[in-house]
């Protein structure tokens, strides 16, 4: 019986050209995590294997960095990076748990523009 739950960073936004950390956390289970696959829609970004360590897909090698932890760091973001990301936890004996993150890459940061103006 699968008792675990995946907590994610949920819906997040980041600025074009910047970087973002995608994080998932598996809780409420004693199952052993054997591997975590990170996917963007149907594309594999990276795999973190408990024995073999991190392996980044060749097409993302320049823009994806492993970690922190089982998370994934996306760098040099473009508007095309907007979309759904999935962390797929392979565990024993439970099986597979999947978490979803929606990333929106913005042309510019509203927060940064706002910080330029000070109210006297």
């Amino acid at each position: 019986m699968m008792t675990g739950t995946i907590e994610t960073t949920g819906n997040i936004s980041a600025e074009k050209g910047g970087s973002i950390i995608l994080q998932c956390h598996l809780s409420s289970t004693t199952a052993q995590v054997t591997q975590v696959n990170w996917e963007q829609q149907d594309q594999l970004l990276a795999i973190c294997n408990a024995d073999l360590g991190w392996h980044i897909s060749p097409s993302f090698k320049d823009r994806v960095a492993p970690g922190p932890g089982l998370g994934l760091t996306l760098q040099s973001l473009t508007v095309n990076d907007t979309g759904e990301y999935f962390c797929i936890y392979h565990t024993y004996p439970d099986g597979t748990y999947t978490g979803r993150i929606f990333l929106e890459v913005l042309e510019s940061s509203v927060a940064e523009h706002g910080a330029r103006f000070q109210i006297p």
Epitope: I47, L52, S57
Partner: nanobody
Framework: EVQLVESGGGLVQAGGSLRLSCAAS????????MGWFRQAPGKEREFVAS????????NYADSVKGRFTISADNAKNTVYLQMNSLKHEDTAVYYC??????????WGQGTQVTVSS
């Protein structure tokens, strides 16, 4: 399922060389990386080296860097471990492992490497 068969182990003098091979068969399309591990008597299994199947990205344990080289022949679905400047502490059973997209590693039966002083 993925089957792994190791070969090339044996007895070698300290300072000598050996080349281990690991042939994969079965559902090899499911493999994204392969690696070598070793287990010495009375010790836990430890990582030695790995190589990604999609490119030539390699990783090594600090204890073997500069002495061991992992390589792959994708056409033959075979991974190799060239071991040079062998030391007594390299004595162990060496296991091949295949990391699979489906989440579970496949393991070989192991090949014994003994380095005599």
């Amino acid at each position: 399922e993925v089957q792994l068969v190791e070969s090339g182990g044996g007895l070698v003098q300290a300072g000598g060389s050996l080349r281990l091979s690991c042939a994969a068969s079965g559902s090899t399309f499911d493999i994204y990386a392969m690696g070598w591990f070793r287990q010495a008597p009375g010790k836990e299994r430890e990582f030695v080296a790995s190589i990604s199947s999609g490119d030539t990205n390699t990783n090594y344990a600090d204890s073997v860097k500069g002495r061991f080289t992992i390589s792959a022949d994708n056409a033959k679905n075979t991974v190799y471990l060239q071991m040079n400047s062998l030391k007594h502490e390299d004595t162990a059973v060496y296991y091949c492992a295949a990391g699979r997209y489906s989440g579970y590693n496949s393991w070989g039966q192991g090949t014994q490497v003994t380095v005599s002083s």
